[in-house]
Interface confidence: medium
């Protein structure tokens, strides 16, 4: 927890942020909570960003005050107005851009006092991988595909049966730039697979880690995938 010391005037209140990541082109959330106030009109929320002259967003007297908002955020920010009264100052950021990455400050004023906390926001691209059997290949082959990643991730294969085995010699990974020239499609092929085994394709960069599993038996194929953001930690 970061308490807003160092601001002269009223008492300090506790403001809490959570470091998070935004997926380019999608909407993101910059998380911030504070000790709530009973009166909405007494709450002021300010979002600032390092390297931006002017505010990212301001909410006060029950509404947005955006007349002096920096151009790069115009039309892209909103708070959850109905949740401010219960202490939610989180900022919704529409159409996340690579340049939105950086350090933000959530600055809160209420009748109880003032406080602030910083938040590290990373941006990139991440997506769920899908693993399929490649029936076009001459030998038993698995194909792992994920449509959007940035920065370029690493891809590692693993298997339940051969735990600890290094599959780099029997796999081939390629990265294909998508049409917007930032994100890339990840394709990794694993050769010489055996049935009655579960294989995992793990894709990871400094923002996210995603895994696609496939279980191949003589009678069926089962798939499962999940994605985890790596830098979500509270301040």
């Amino acid at each position: 927890l970061i308490i807003g010391f160092g601001i002269s005037g009223r008492h300090s209140i506790t403001v809490t942020t959570v470091a998070s990541a935004g997926n380019i082109g999608e909407d993101g959330i910059l998380s911030c909570t504070f000790e709530p106030d009973i009166k909405l009109s007494d709450i002021v929320i300010q979002w600032l960003k390092e390297g931006v002259l002017g505010l990212v967003h301001e909410f006060k007297e029950g509404k947005d005050e955006l007349s002096e908002q920096d151009e790069m955020f115009r039309g892209r920010t909103a708070v959850f107005a109905d949740q401010v009264i219960v202490g939610n100052a989180s900022l919704r950021l529409k159409n996340v851009q690579l340049t939105d990455a950086g350090t933000y400050k959530c600055y809160i004023i209420t009748s109880k006092g003032k406080g602030n906390a910083n938040l590290e926001y990373k941006t990139g691209a991440f997506s769920m991988p899908e693993v399929n059997v490649d029936y076009n290949a001459s030998s038993e082959t698995l194909r792992c595909e994920a449509p959007r990643w940035f920065p370029q991730p690493t891809v590692v294969w693993a298997s339940q049966v051969d735990q600890g085995a290094n599959f780099s010699e029997v796999s081939n990974t390629s990265f294909e730039l998508n049409s917007e020239n930032v994100t890339m499609k990840v394709v990794s092929v694993l050769y010489n697979v055996t049935i009655n085994n579960t294989y995992s394709c793990m894709i990871e960069n400094d923002i996210a880690k995603a895994t696609g599993d496939i279980k191949v038996t003589e009678s069926e194929i089962k798939r499962r995938s999940h994605l985890q953001l790596l830098n979500s930690k509270a301040s």
Epitope: L48, E50, G51, V52, L55, E68
Partner: antibody, heavy 126, light 113 residues
């Protein structure tokens, strides 16, 4: 376009308190996304930041003057004020109020001054 | 505190000629995480308050003529007036807003030769 106007006595005796007020017109001091500050300029010399205030009352002071400075705000009058105690001849200067367009670096709120008052000369002399 | 040192203290330039003012900071005002220089330039005409010209070392404030340009990075910065006009006679100040307290240079007086 925002306008700022300083007012207060032009002559203050040594050891007394210098008091100035800045009135902001064209726009409300409490409904904009700006901070407000005081800067001074001794005759024929450079500029020195004194301190900054937000409409809520949050203040940031120059460490070199912190023990003697108080900046306050009166949103009902659209004004903010400067008090500088125990003045000496070294405090003789043109005092400006200004609007601060804020940014943040390493967690500290700071910025550039985009609109200034005309300034008022305060002479410290007995 | 970061000390800002300007050079020269004054310069005289013919109308239509280029004027160049330098500003050096005692420590870098370049923030590596966003690659921005936290430096501004102001113009102060006789009997008037300062006027913001440039911020982020090279971004012109709205309404400032394009004959004014800023350059430099880290600790060394330059304000250039590409073609001096009579109305440019003034004292010019640099200011760092990288760390608190914000500090100004001592000023450079620009006159017509």
């Amino acid at each position: 376009q925002v306008q700022l106007q300083e007012s207060g006595p032009g002559l203050v005796k040594p050891s007394e308190t210098l008091s100035l007020t800045c009135t902001v017109s064209t726009g409300s001091i409490s409904s904009s996304s700006y901070y407000w500050g005081w800067i001074r300029q001794p005759p024929g010399k450079g500029l020195e930041w004194i301190g900054t205030i937000y409409f809520s009352g949050s203040t940031y002071y120059n460490p070199s003057l912190k023990s003697r400075v108080t900046i306050s705000v009166d949103t009902s009058k659209n004004q903010f004020s400067l008090k500088l105690t125990s003045v000496t001849a070294a405090d003789t200067a043109v005092y400006y109020c200004a609007r601060l367009r804020v940014t943040m670096v390493r967690g500290v709120i700071i910025g550039v001054f985009d609109f200034w008052g005309q300034g008022t000369l305060v002479t410290v002399s007995s | 505190d970061i000390v800002m040192t300007q050079s020269p203290d004054s310069l005289a330039v013919s109308l239509g000629e280029r004027a160049t003012i330098n500003c050096k900071s005692s420590q870098s005002v370049l923030y590596s995480s966003n690659n921005k220089n936290y430096l501004a330039w102001y113009q102060q005409k006789p009997g008037q308050p300062p006027k913001l010209l440039i911020y982020w070392a090279s971004t012109r404030e709205s309404g400032v003529p394009d004959r004014f340009s800023g350059s430099g990075s880290g600790t060394d910065f330059t304000l250039t007036i590409s073609s001096l006009q009579a109305e440019d006679v003034a004292v010019y100040y640099c200011q760092q807003y990288y760390s608190t307290p914000p500090t100004f240079g001592q000023g450079t007086k620009v006159e017509i030769k």
